[in-house]
Interface confidence: low
Amino acid sequence: KPVSLSYRCPCRFFESHVARANVKHLKILNTPNCALQIVARLKNNNRQVCIDPKLKWIQEYLEKALNKRFKM
């Protein structure tokens, strides 16, 4: 019997070989029941990919973003 469309997170897997220099822009998705989803638009091929939140430069980016938010 057909079921209603099931819940799926936007990121199927996370890519850990994404250079900061190849990122056009980032978006952080706050999707319920999902791990932190960070999506990058790449400069070289315009595709959107999910970035591993454990990447060093991502951690630095998030830290800066949070500091900015709390300073305001």
Partner: antibody, heavy 123, light 107 residues
């Protein structure tokens, strides 16, 4: 490779419902973001709805809200689109289409389409 | 809803001609525009996504450009197999609207 195979043509009376199926091969249905698009004879393409991973739910075009239901059977990797209260203006070819994805599911475009199912509404 | 206005609605051209199809969005949509080619009795076929990126296998004579509200699909040298209808589509936000189509016919 991914293939979407749709059910055959249907002829329906006004007021009836139609259920079109779309069988996925080459991938499992839960790995896809499936959408439905229709095209009236000689007209353009009209997006009806589909699964939006960012919201975690199926979203429908307002025009079809309350009249369309999109479901799936994960055991057979088949997606369904049911449209009720049919009128002559619903005569169209109905397509299922997969949204492009890599690591990120809703990656912009519809890259793979079913062959289309012609639904004719006539008394 | 975001409206996609495509022009021209039809055009006649000869093999070897340069053809340009334009699409205007009713609001700024960055580069979230895709282009499809459709032949009679067939499903649409993705040519271009993210405004300017070719889908794999698409001939290099097809190029896309634009950002914000104005987008262009160009066929640098029209080939016999290019006579078809072309649609733009926005994937910026649902509902994912299409342009009304441009039919490219043989002159």
């Amino acid at each position: 490779q991914v293939q979407l195979v749709q059910s055959g043509a249907e002829v329906k009376k006004p007021g009836a419902s139609v259920k079109v199926s779309c069988k996925v091969s080459g991938y499992t249905l839960t790995e896809l973001s499936m959408h439905w698009v229709r095209q009236a004879p000689g007209k353009g393409l009209e997006w009806m709805g589909g699964f939006d991973p960012e919201d975690g739910e199926t979203i429908y075009a307002q025009k079809f809200q309350g009249r369309v239901t999109m479901t799936e059977d994960t055991s057979t990797d088949t997606a369904y689109m049911e449209l009720s209260s049919l009128g002559s203006e619903d005569t169209a070819v109905y397509y299922c289409a997969r949204r492009v994805w890599g690591s990120y599911r809703p990656n912009d475009a519809f890259d793979i389409w079913g062959q289309g199912t012609l639904v004719t509404v006539s008394s | 809803d975001i409206q996609m206005t495509q022009s021209p609605s039809s055009l006649s051209a000869s093999v070897g001609d340069r053809v340009t199809i334009t699409c205007r969005a009713s609001q700024s949509i960055s580069d979230y525009v895709n282009w499809y080619q459709q032949k009679p009795g067939k499903a649409p076929n993705l040519l271009m996504f993210a405004a300017s990126t070719s889908q794999s296998g698409v001939p290099s004579r097809f190029t896309g450009s634009g950002s914000g509200t104005d987008f262009t699909l160009t066929i640098s040298s029209l080939q016999p197999e290019d006579f078809a209808t072309y649609f733009c589509q926005q994937s910026y936000s649902p509902p994912y609207t299409f342009g009304q189509g441009t039919k490219v016919e043989i002159k």
